[in-house]
Every structure is written in structure tokens, then in C-alpha cells.
Amino acid sequence: APTSSSTKKTQLQLEHLLLDLQMILNGINNYKNPKLTRMLTFKFYMPKKATELKHLQCLEEELKPLEEVLNLAQSKNFHLRPRDLISNINVIVLELKGSETTFMCEYADETATIVEFLNRWITFCQSIISTLT
């Protein structure tokens, strides 16, 4: 059974992931980003279901495409280079989803823009955090 300390750690990691995703979204989804329209041409795959930490597998598999899009953005939009930012997110995702069980991600038929993709995973983090508090 999860202890209060492990629950707290999970909550902090989710909050960190949430802040990173929100920072990316705010950095790209505004009219001051001249590459926004170009970024919106990139296609992202969405999870069929995202209600548990194991479903973060679906996010992990889309981190490389996310990095490619972020490479279009100016570095001043973020406090880190895209490679470092994605690496940090990857570390958190791996810790949160755990590596004990291998979960095969199921994707929805509908694809999404980077904005829809980020909003979906932001909602996921907020939802899980709310169940922990």
C-alpha cells in the first residue's frame, strides 16, 4: 500500500510535470511565437484512456516528437534547451509510471495538435493530483 511519504513524492513529481507542461504550452501558444502556425502542423497521438499513472507510457512515447516541435521555438521561450527540458520530463515520467510492469499504450483514432496534446496531459496531471490531495 502506498505510504503518505510516497504519495507526497508522487504528488510533487506530478506538480513538477504539470508545471513543465504548462510552461511549454504558455511558451508556444501565444501570438508572439512566430513559429506557432508551423508547430500546429505537427501531429500528436493521444491516449485512448488516461486515468492512471501507468498511462504516462503514452506521454513518454510522444516526447521525441515533442522535442522536435520545441526545436522550432526560440530558446528564450523556455528557461532550458528543448533537449534538456524533454530529458527532465522523461525522468519524471519514468519515475511516476514505474518500470515494474510493461504497459502497452493504446492510442485514440483522432490525432491532435501540440496545443491539444499538451492540454490533454495537463488535465491528466491535474486530475491525478486532485485524487491525491
Partner: antibody, heavy 119, light 108 residues
Framework: QVQLVQSGGGVVQPGRSLRLSCAAS????????MNWVRQAPGKGLEWVTL????????YYADSVKGRFTTSRDNSKNTLYLQMNSLRAEDTAVYYC????????????WGQGTMVTVSS | SYELTQPPSLSVSPGQTATISCSGD??????AYWYQQKSGQAPVLVIY???RRPSGIPERFSGSSSGTMATLTISGAQVEDEADYFC???????????FGGGTKLTVL
């Protein structure tokens, strides 16, 4: 209504210069990145250049780099394309086009203006 | 440089279905957009993000994408649909917008 009205086309000799203008109305011009796209007679569409909302960032197709310069005057709601060292292959209809902020394409286009480079 | 390949022309009778293909290596990871350009006019967006239709575009226009191929379908083509159709996306890296060569649709 949202509109882009172009002016400044014409016939020009090779090696000479020409400036195109694109006047925007019906939307907050200073909130949008803007493009120029051209179409040679009987040919397809070719993206030429992009300028950011404030004019601080500019991107060009390789075919025009070093010869064409895009600029904007947000106080006049106007986009410009300065074309220098013109070549016969620059002959085309030139369109100004607005970058959408919600989808990955150009969502508003000007009516187009013809530029003919000929001796 | 990155290329999108379309058939140069297509002819259908009124009421028939017109299917225009666009091939590009980046499509598994890029959305396709379709512009309609009638003679002497500026292009108009008819499909965005593979399948979505802007408001004001008739329901007979639809889009799909699978693998490296994007498709524009006009179900029950009308005489007024006669135009050039261009597919569009960005280069693999996303830096440059790219248009297909265009397909001239004749409806007669």
C-alpha cells in the same frame, strides 16, 4: 470584415527593384505573423517569407534569401515586400497571407498582385 | 528539399466523387491542409488538420490521411467545385511551408 488589400505590382526589368504593399483591416494586425506566397504563371504556390508579429524575426525561402526583404509597419497596419535584384524566375502573382493562431495554415489571403520581370 | 506530390489533373462528371491524393514522407507526423483556388482568385482553405472543415465549406468536402498519403474527397462534385486544389504542410523539420504542385479538377 477581415481583409488584406495588396498594391505595388507591375512590370520591371531584370536586376531592378520593386516594393509590394499589403494593407490589413478588420483584425488586430500587430497580433499576427504574416507571410508572402507567390505563384508563377500556370504553376503551384511557393512560400516566400514570414515575419513575426513585431517584425523582429524574419524567415525566407532559399530562392529569395539575400534579395527580398519583408517588413511591417504596425502603426499603419501594412506589410511590405522589398524585392531587389529581380530575375525572370521571380515573375509571379504575389499574395500576402496571414498566419492562423489556431491552426497550422494561412487563413486570410490578399487578392494577389502580378509582378512581371522582363526586359 | 521536401516535396508533396499530387496528380496534375482530374476530370469528373457532376454528381460523381472526386478523389485527389497528396503524397509526402512527413505525413505520418504532419497534418495535411487543402486549399481550393478558382481561376484568378486567391486560395481558400477547405480542409485543415487532415479531416476538419472550416465553417462555410460544404459538407461534400472531406479529408483523410493514412501513412504517407493524404486525400481530399469531394462527394457529389458540383460545377462550382472546378478549381485547382493544393495540399499543404510543413517540411519535416517544420521550418518551411510546402505546397503540392496542385491538381486541376474539371467538372463537366
Amino acid at each position: 470584415q477581415v481583409q488584406l488589400v495588396q498594391s505595388g505590382g507591375g512590370v520591371v526589368q531584370p536586376g531592378r527593384s520593386l516594393r509590394l504593399s499589403c494593407a490589413a483591416s478588420g483584425f488586430t494586425f500587430s497580433n499576427y505573423a504574416m507571410n508572402w506566397v507567390r505563384q508563377a504563371p500556370g504553376k503551384g504556390l511557393e512560400w516566400v517569407t514570414l515575419i513575426s508579429y513585431d517584425g523582429s524575426q524574419k524567415y525566407y525561402a532559399d530562392s529569395v534569401k539575400g534579395r527580398f526583404t519583408t517588413s511591417r509597419d504596425n502603426s499603419k497596419n501594412t506589410l511590405y515586400l522589398q524585392m531587389n535584384s529581380l530575375r525572370a524566375e521571380d515573375t509571379a502573382v504575389y499574395y500576402c497571407a496571414r498566419d492562423s493562431t489556431t491552426l497550422g495554415a494561412f487563413d486570410v489571403w490578399g487578392q494577389g498582385t502580378m509582378v512581371t520581370v522582363s526586359s | 528539399s521536401y516535396e508533396l506530390t499530387q496528380p496534375p489533373s482530374l476530370s469528373v462528371s457532376p454528381g460523381q466523387t472526386a478523389t485527389i491524393s497528396c503524397s509526402g514522407d512527413a505525413f505520418p507526423r504532419k497534418f495535411a491542409y487543402w486549399y481550393q483556388q478558382k481561376s484568378g482568385q486567391a486560395p481558400v482553405l477547405v480542409i485543415y488538420e487532415d479531416t476538419r472543415r472550416p465553417s462555410g465549406i460544404p459538407e461534400r468536402f472531406s479529408g483523410s490521411s493514412s501513412g504517407t498519403m493524404a486525400t481530399l474527397t469531394i462527394s457529389g462534385a458540383q460545377v462550382e467545385d472546378e478549381a485547382d486544389y493544393f495540399c499543404y504542410t510543413t517540411s519535416s523539420s517544420g521550418t518551411h511551408p510546402v505546397f503540392g504542385g496542385g491538381t486541376k479538377l474539371t467538372v463537366l
